[in-house]
């Protein structure tokens, strides 16, 4: 029986050009974490494997940094980074736990008014 729960950083609004940390924490289980995948909209961003360490997908290498811990740092944010991010914990013997975080990237100083995304 899966007893664990995932706690996340919570949804985030961030400014274009900035950086944010996405973090998840698995609690209430003694299961062993074998791997954590970070994904966005069916795209794999990064993997942290208990034995092999971190692997960042080549297309995100410039803007994604591992950590802190099992979290992920996104840098040089663009409006196209707006979307839902998933932390997927592979554990033994429980199986898979998934956390969800929505990131909204705003144009600078428009959280209060104005359009959020500008098409170039």
């Amino acid at each position: 029986m899966m007893t664990g729960t995932i706690e996340t950083t919570g949804n985030i609004s961030a400014e274009k050009g900035g950086s944010i940390i996405l973090q998840c924490h698995l609690s209430s289980t003694t299961a062993q974490v074998t791997q954590v995948n970070w994904e966005q909209q069916d795209q794999l961003l990064a993997i942290c494997n208990a034995d092999l360490g971190w692997h960042i997908s080549p297309s995100f290498k410039d803007r994604v940094a591992p950590g802190p811990g099992l979290g992920l740092t996104l840098q040089s944010l663009t409006v196209n980074d707006t979307g839902e991010y998933f932390c997927i914990y592979h554990t033994y013997p429980d199986g898979t736990y998934t956390g969800r975080i929505f990131l909204e990237v705003l144009e600078s100083s428009v959280a209060e008014h104005g359009a959020r995304f500008q098409i170039p």
């Epitope: 919570g10 196209n80 959020r116 995304f117």
Partner: antibody
């Protein structure tokens, strides 16, 4: 003036599908997230999901995965929600609502869906 | 999913009254950056819901200053200082901090 104009009431048979539209005006359509909300029994509000007109990205409430499909047509500044395999439980008022920083600042007038044989 | 519990379910009032509506969350609504995405809405019969307050205490444009929001963590309150006829309807809180967003069950503000 920001306006979200939704399509009219629908009466459909169980098992059928329906497409509800939400035409936006008075602002940059691609600049804001569009949310969809279900109101059952004239009271309970449930978030169905959202779509990001800028890049087509979606996020769904797990409860509505497979039931609702969200799309947009940027050229007409219109958001759509397809509701599939309808049952009487889907009878409700459905709203589109513009989102910014996890608040819904403008809402459509609502579309009443009645599923009945 | 995060559960928002609103109290009271029904609030009979007289015009001119001051009232408070409570919204309690099953977990903290503060994200790791200190933002709390808790908003309040009024749904009048035959109309669309309208945004009153966002991020706990910020009044949306055009909302009268008799509406105010407060709270932190898991406990939030909407206060209406002097009830007017146009304030009658259903009030809902909404949390946007955790996926999926969830609404409170609503509080009906009605005349005594």
């Amino acid at each position: 003036e920001v306006q979200l104009q939704q399509s009219g009431p629908e009466l459909v048979k169980p098992g059928a599908s329906v497409k509800i539209s939400c035409k936006a005006s008075g602002y940059s359509f691609t600049g804001y997230i569009m949310n969809w909300v279900k109101q059952s029994h004239g009271k309970n509000l449930e978030w169905i999901g959202l779509i990001i007109p800028y890049n087509g990205g979606t996020s769904y409430n797990q409860k509505f995965r497979g039931k609702a499909t969200l799309t947009v047509d940027k050229s007409s500044s219109t958001a759509y929600m397809d509701l599939l395999s309808l049952t009487s439980d889907d009878s409700a008022v459905y709203y589109c609502a513009r989102g910014l920083s996890y608040r819904y600042d403008y809402w459509g007038q609502g579309t009443t869906l009645t599923v009945s044989s | 999913d995060v559960v928002l519990t609103q109290t009271p379910l029904s609030l009979p009032v007289s015009f001119g009254d001051q009232v408070s509506i409570s919204c309690r969350s099953s977990q903290s609504l503060a994200n790791s950056y200190g933002n709390t995405y808790l908003s309040w809405y009024l749904h009048k019969p035959g109309q669309s819901p309208q945004l009153l307050i966002y991020e706990i205490s910020n009044r949306f444009s055009g909302v009268p200053d008799r509406f105010s929001g407060s709270g932190s963590g898991t406990d939030f309150t909407l206060k209406i200082s002097t009830i007017k006829p146009e304030d009658l309807g259903m009030y809902y809180c909404l949390q946007g901090t955790h996926q999926p967003p969830t609404f409170g069950g609503g509080t009906k503000l009605e005349i005594k």
